[in-house]
């Protein structure tokens, strides 16, 4: 049995992802998506504009990236939020900002968070405000897995190709 | 003996890793630059010190990284800013901090922002302050493209090899 | 059946991927560690749970990643901190938060900072607070080098697999 009698980390190493026997072994799946600036109250990912691209088998499905082949991928995303001060008479309620990259696989009845960043902003205190969040990491993914994002604070996004993006590449 | 009589950072540069005599196809262009700590009111990138390096064709020209061969690159940068409180009598004006990686390409007559992060700081409210910004993503670049940075808030940079850096590697 | 009756993370660990018998040249050392959520006042890295893994020679020793072979690696880490407001009567003392990836190498008798991010938080001003820090970069490392982290503000860490992690992969 894989991993039997091994330490946890050795067992972990022993039981890895299938590697593809590709004739086109030089393929390097990669994707970089940007938030559609024409959609102000949602975050729609686009790959057919500006510096965005889908390469070597990545594709989009329901605003998710589809993993083209099993293996290890570096997955990353950034968002930038901005806002104005509350008026002096308004109650300064805190604003929860968060951005998460999620994995959906039908093994689970829910989205598994892969990368999460969070921030509390207090607009009444800080007049106009700006906040950036970035994260990225390496994950073992399987062909057909779906990578998506969830964002709290979408109306505050600064939607431009250099501020709001989501991508992945095979290692 | 490698590095004898050198300063630690010069010794670091002198004793690089043994390189294999690789076929061209295995070349992996990579670069990691650090902000020169001796230049307090500018951000000058250096590759000949500490942990910084240029490998397999990357070069530095006019404070920009020159892309050695066309392909997809992961490009990244970080800055850390710090500041003191304004004196109680001073007007607390907001401080706009921003850091951007830009592309200059023969295809365009201007610098294209690739990666942007931004922050507003209100020193009067928050006494001594510290703020970190990081971003990175994959881009399709062309041989000869120039990657540079633009920073708002340079006098507030915490210039050390581990806090202010800029790099790229071919995928 | 793999994962039957297990919690999602246990199921995740149970169902790993078969490894191919690859020629040495295609080995791609990679590691992704997560902070152990059962250890509230320390930051212990784990590779045998959730989405964490050690591949192709990476190992974990004394809470450090051991570099399996000399070369260039992308090294990254993230932490998320949170806290509550100070009570109105308490003195609002600033809280220094920092996270650093360090290198310990036989070449040096001390830990060399590779990646550093820092933040000052003023809990009295901002009631409940949340702050994320991420950084990553490419470094030339030597077989046997030890990569570790140092964190100021450990009691404030939000320990979950998607918020606190540390990893590296060979380029």
């Amino acid at each position: 049995l894989p991993g039997v009698g091994l330490t946890p980390s050795a067992a972990q190493t022993a039981r890895q992802h299938p590697k593809m026997h590709l004739a086109h072994s030089t393929l390097k799946p990669a994707a970089h998506l940007i938030g559609d600036p024409s959609k102000q109250n949602s975050l729609l990912w686009r790959a057919n504009t500006d510096r965005a691209f889908l390469q070597d088998g990545f594709s989009l499905s329901n605003n998710s990236l589809l993993v083209p082949t099993s293996g290890i991928y570096f997955v990353y995303s950034q968002v930038v939020f901005s806002g104005k001060a509350y008026s002096p008479k308004a109650t300064s309620s805190p604003l929860y900002l968060a951005h998460e990259v999620q994995l959906f696989s039908s093994q689970y009845p829910f989205h598994v968070p892969l990368l999460s960043s969070q921030k509390m902003v207090y607009p009444g205190l800080q007049e106009p405000w700006l906040h950036s969040m970035y994260h990225g990491a390496a994950f073992q993914l399987t062909q057909g897995d779906q990578l998506s994002t969830h964002t709290d604070g979408i109306p505050h996004l600064v939607l431009s190709p250099s501020t709001v993006f989501f991508g992945a590449f095979a290692l | 003996l490698p590095g004898v009589g050198l300063t630690p950072s010069a010794a670091q540069t002198a004793r690089q890793h043994p390189k294999m005599h690789l076929a061209h196809s295995t070349l992996k262009p990579a670069a990691h630059l650090i902000g020169d700590p001796s230049k307090q009111n500018s951000l000058l990138w250096r590759a000949n010190t500490d942990r910084a390096f240029l490998q397999d064709g990357f070069s530095l020209s006019n404070n920009s990284l020159l892309v050695p061969t066309s392909g997809i690159y992961f490009v990244y940068s970080q800055v850390v800013f710090s500041g003191k409180a304004y004196s109680p009598k001073a007007t607390s004006s907001p401080l706009y901090l921003a850091h951007e990686v830009q592309l200059f390409s023969s295809q365009y007559p201007f610098h294209v922002p690739l990666l942007s992060s931004q922050k507003m700081v209100y020193p009067g409210l928050q006494e001594p302050w510290l703020h970190s910004m990081y971003h990175g993503a994959a881009f399709q670049l062309t041989q000869g493209d120039q990657l540079s940075t633009h920073t708002d808030g340079i006098p507030h940079l915490v210039l050390s090899p581990s806090t202010v850096f800029f790099g790229a590697f071919a995928l | 059946l793999p994962g039957v009756g297990l919690t999602p993370s246990a199921a995740q660990t149970a169902r790993q991927h078969p490894k191919m018998h690859l020629a040495h040249s295609t080995l791609k050392p990679a590691a992704h560690l997560i902070g152990d959520p059962s250890k509230q006042n320390s930051l212990l890295w784990r590779a045998n749970t959730d989405r964490a893994f050690l591949q192709d020679g990476f190992s974990l020793s004394n809470n450090s990643l051991l570099v399996p072979t000399s070369g260039i690696y992308f090294v990254y880490s993230q932490v998320v901190f949170s806290g509550k407001a100070y009570s109105p009567k308490a003195t609002s003392s600033p809280l220094y938060l920092a996270h650093e990836v360090q290198l310990f190498s036989s070449q040096y008798p001390f830990h060399v900072p590779l990646l550093s991010s820092q933040k000052m938080v003023y809990p009295g001003l901002q009631e409940p607070w949340l702050h994320s820090m991420y950084h990553g970069a490419a470094f030339q490392l030597t077989q046997g080098d030890q990569l570790s982290t140092h964190t100021d503000g450990i009691p404030h860490l939000v320990l979950s697999p998607s918020t606190v992690f540390f990893g590296a992969f060979a380029l």
Partner: antibody
Framework: EVQLVESGGGLVQPGGSLRLSCAAS????????IHWVRQAPGKGLEWVGY????????NYNEKFKGRATISSDKSKNTAYLQMNSLRAEDTAVYYC???????????WGQGTLVTVSS | DIQMTQSPSSLSASVGDRVTITCRAS??????VAWYQQKPGKAPKLQIY???HRYTGVPSRFSGSGSGTDFTLTISSLQPEDFATYYC?????????FGQGTKVEIK
């Protein structure tokens, strides 16, 4: 050598169901998804959806959601397409296909004809 | 869904001819287009992926080009075994969709 063999086609009454099988060999079954693609007589190709035998992950063409179920049995190296509430316009040759990269249909079975008619 | 429109729907050509088939997407699909060859009673065969990359074993006389919305499959010198129906497919966004086909017949 990668081989895919479909079976289970034939004549089905309108409103009825079908269950097609795709027996795979010549590769590690859990390393790739299995797609189903159909082709009506004299017409073009239409992607139905895929299943990943490794983790049972699925993705469907919205047009077939609710009517099609794609599954697999690792122990038998076999994938399945179940389609319900069949109509005349579902008459087609149904192919299973194994990709290299996910959206590239690199290996195909010979196809199995399903005729929906009373 | 993204519509893929091929032209012409059929063409007649002789052995040795240069043949060009075009495919237009209803919206930009970057370079995410594949081409397949299908002979009567047989399953399709992958020829080109990512607009311009020949699949393993496909002869060099087959080439693809294009990006955005307009794509082309070219057979530089038609051979007897190339008479078949050719389909384009966008692999940018699901549902992955195919063109209606172009039948290449012997003149």
């Amino acid at each position: 050598e990668v081989q895919l063999v479909e079976s289970g086609g034939g004549l089905v009454q309108p409103g009825g169901s079908l269950r097609l099988s795709c027996a795979a060999s010549g590769y590690t079954f859990t390393s790739y998804v299995i797609h189903w693609v159909r082709q009506a007589p004299g017409k073009g190709l239409e992607w139905v959806g895929y299943n990943n035998p490794y983790n049972d992950g699925t993705n469907y063409n919205e047009k077939f959601k609710g009517r099609a179920t794609i599954s697999s049995d690792k122990s038998k190296n076999t994938a399945y397409l179940q389609m319900n509430s069949l109509r005349a316009e579902d008459t087609a040759v149904y192919y299973c296909s194994r990709p290299t990269m996910l959206p590239w249909f690199a290996y195909w079975g010979q196809g199995t004809l399903v005729t929906v008619s009373s | 869904d993204i519509q893929m429109t091929q032209s012409p729907s059929s063409l007649s050509a002789s052995v040795g001819d240069r043949v060009t088939i075009t495919c237009r997407a209803s919206q930009a699909v970057s370079s995410a287009v594949a081409w397949y060859q299908q002979k009567p009673g047989k399953a399709p065969k992958l020829q080109i992926y990512s607009a311009s990359h020949r699949y393993t074993g496909v002869p060099s006389r087959f080439s693809g080009s294009g990006s955005g919305t307009d794509f082309t499959l070219t057979i530089s010198s038609l051979q007897p075994e190339d008479f078949a129906t050719y389909y384009c497919q966008q692999h940018y966004y699901t549902p992955w969709t195919f063109g209606q086909g172009t039948k290449v017949e012997i003149k």
